[in-house]
């Protein structure tokens, strides 16, 4: 390596206000826990002739680090050890040979809070940019997954529900998806940022909750969304007290309820009363019941909360890392209410059994 042991021209911080050495970076960046952020950064360093052919090494250090003793949090120097707690999560994404010191942080953790400074080394030219420093603020994860239900749900007919975290970023560790549902389910395909649950609803699944929980294990943070399955009974021109389905699987509108009830107003009224009663009981029961499913690898126990009105403690934990890209500012989730999904029952009597067993399905 050329002039490897030449006396450094500039000592770290010795010329903090040196106009020949400058760095441009935002002084503060905010990232939600478990998510990621890319901080643009450029710097300039004058180089004497004897270092012009030397490789440029860049380093990001925590504020207060002693260069000779402490490892950086990120560097492009391959044989350089980095801090264990930031390894693989902090990356010097920019190319220092092109004066780019951009820093990428994925799977942001609470303990990443703090200030960081950049240092360049090129042969015997070495300089720590003590100003400006980058201040990283890690805030609560406010993003929540979205659950997509294509059309209406029909009893006995399978539907693909998709839980997605489109706000997660590609660079992070893919999250763990966990589904919690009383209805018969199986797992469909998953992508980096979405999971498909195949649900085959039954009449008794009316009023039950379906939860998609997403764990960003890289940061030990969990977020979830719960929707409530709203079951609507749709008779098919009844002739007896039992309404078998025709097997066509065709979707009917809510208007079908009215048409089917004209020939038997008494039956319809009674049925409506039963449904309302069942719905009320299930809803009340659901609010009181604590749904708890215990998972393994509870290395970072966190409590994911449903909406403020329907808080149900959940301890679903599984090892995964994050992959979310929040920008510098957190996004506020607008919808904090429970969502209602409609299950249309064609020609089936609602079950009188209101007790519900929940099953948990996980995808990693």
């Amino acid at each position: 390596m050329p002039l490897l042991l030449l006396l450094p021209l500039l000592w770290a911080g010795a010329l903090a206000m040196d106009p020949n050495f400058w760095l441009q970076v935002q002084e503060s960046v905010t990232v939600q826990e478990g998510l990621c952020v890319l901080v643009p950064c450029t710097f300039f360093h004058p180089i004497p002739y004897y270092d012009k052919n030397s490789p440029v090494h860049g380093y990001w250090f925590r504020e207060g680090a002693i260069i000779s003793r402490d490892s950086p949090v990120a560097t492009n120097k391959l044989d350089q050890e980095v801090q264990e707690e930031t390894q693989g999560r902090f990356r010097l994404l920019g190319d220092p040979s092109r004066n780019n010191c951009s820093l990428s942080i994925v799977d942001a953790r609470r303990r990443d809070n703090g200030s960081y400074f950049f240092r360049m080394e090129r042969g015997s030219t070495k300089y720590s940019y003590k100003s400006p420093q980058l201040s990283v603020h890690v805030t609560d994860l406010t993003h929540r997954p979205k659950i997509l239900i294509p059309g209406t749900l029909e009893p006995g007919h399978s539907k693909n529900l998709t839980c997605s975290v489109s706000w997660a970023c590609e660079q992070g560790t893919p999250p763990i998806f966990s589904w919690l549902s009383a209805a018969p389910t199986s797992l469909g395909p998953r992508t980096t940022h979405s999971s498909v649950l195949i649900i085959t609803p039954r009449p008794q699944d009316h009023g039950t909750n379906l939860t998609c929980q997403v764990k960003f294990a890289g940061a030990g943070v969990t977020t979830e969304r719960t929707i409530q399955l709203n079951v609507t009974y749709v008779p098919q021109n009844p002739t007896t007290g039992i309404f078998p389905g025709d097997g066509s699987g065709k979707q009917e509108t809510r208007a079908g309820v009215v048409h089917g009830a004209i020939g038997g107003a008494g039956v319809t009224a009674l049925l409506a009363l039963c449904l309302c009663l069942i719905f009320f009981i299930v809803k009340t029961h659901r609010r009181k019941a604590a749904r708890t499913a215990v998972g393994r690898n509870d290395t970072h126990p966190t409590t994911g909360s449903a909406s403020p009105k329907h808080q149900k403690k959940s301890k679903l934990h599984g090892p995964t890392e994050t992959s979310s890209c929040s920008g510098a500012a957190p996004t506020v989730e607008m919808d904090e209410e429970l969502h209602y999904a409609s299950l249309n029952f064609h020609g089936m009597n609602p079950s009188k059994d209101t007790s519900t067993e929940y099953s948990e399905v996980r995808t990693q």
Partner: antibody
Framework: QVQLVQSGGDLAQPGRSLRLSCAAS????????MHWVRQAPGKGLEWVAV????????YYGDSVKGRFTVSRDNPKNTLYLQMNSLRAEDTAIYYC?????????WGQGTLVTVSS | DIQLTQSPSSLSAYVGGRVTITCQAS??????LNWFQQKPGKAPKLLIS???NLEPGVPSRFSGSGSGTDFTFTITNLQPEDIATYYC?????????FGGGTKVEIK
């Protein structure tokens, strides 16, 4: 203490060759880049050549490029300047210089006279 | 090549007086400039590196400043032993180049 002792200066005819030596002592020779600088009588300083600590990179001033060769023998702690195709304008005192951040140590200089 | 224009080429000053020498580079050289002192019959001696850093053992009456293309070398409280020729030299890029020199004499 650091010393750079030069030798090899002489009178040479145009077109002939000379080899200058610079023996280093008092420091770890292979840690340092080394330069040759010259000064024609009554004139200013002119940079001639540089060689990297490991000998891997060498650079020359325009006026000597292709005629002079700088080399070093690290085990012997010695720097060389091979001067071929000498010209009258190469007449000067030649200095070897140690590079440590800046040019902190110079040899005593050796006179090369090119004349017919 | 980077040219260094040094001025004046010679000057005369009183003992205890102040001497200022300028060195202008043909292009920006950041702070990569040395100042040397050469006394008759001797090898040059480095006084200032990096445009303004005084070398160890050099009296504090010598100073340097500047960055980019314009540099200044100053001797305050001129002493008889300061009679010499002073050179600036850039090491921003190869080939390394020197200014033409400034000869300082005592009045």
């Amino acid at each position: 203490q650091v010393q750079l002792v030069q030798s090899g200066g002489d009178l040479a005819q145009p077109g002939r060759s000379l080899r200058l030596s610079c023996a280093a002592s008092g420091f770890t020779f292979d840690d340092y880049a080394m330069h040759w600088v010259r000064q024609a009588p009554g004139k200013g300083l002119e940079w001639v050549a540089v060689i990297w600590p490991d000998g891997g990179q060498k650079y020359y001033g325009d006026s000597v490029k292709g005629r002079f060769t700088v080399s070093r023998d690290n085990p012997k702690n010695t720097l060389y300047l091979q001067m071929n195709s000498l010209r009258a304008e190469d007449t000067a005192i030649y200095y070897c210089v140690r590079h440590f951040n800046a040019w902190d140590y110079w040899g005593q200089g050796t006179l090369v006279t090119v004349s017919s | 090549d980077i040219q260094l224009t040094q001025s004046p080429s010679s000057l005369s000053a009183y003992v205890g007086g102040r001497v200022t020498i300028t060195c202008q580079a043909s292009q920006g050289i950041s702070q990569f400039l040395n100042w040397f002192q050469q006394k008759p019959g001797k090898a040059p001696k480095l006084l200032i590196s990096d445009a303004s850093n005084l070398e160890p053992g050099v009296p504090s009456r010598f100073s340097g400043s500047g960055s980019g293309t314009d540099f200044t070398f100053t001797i305050t409280n001129l002493q008889p032993e300061d009679i010499a020729t002073y050179y600036c030299q850039q090491y921003d890029d190869l080939p390394l180049t020197f200014g033409g020199g400034t000869k300082v004499e005592i009045k």
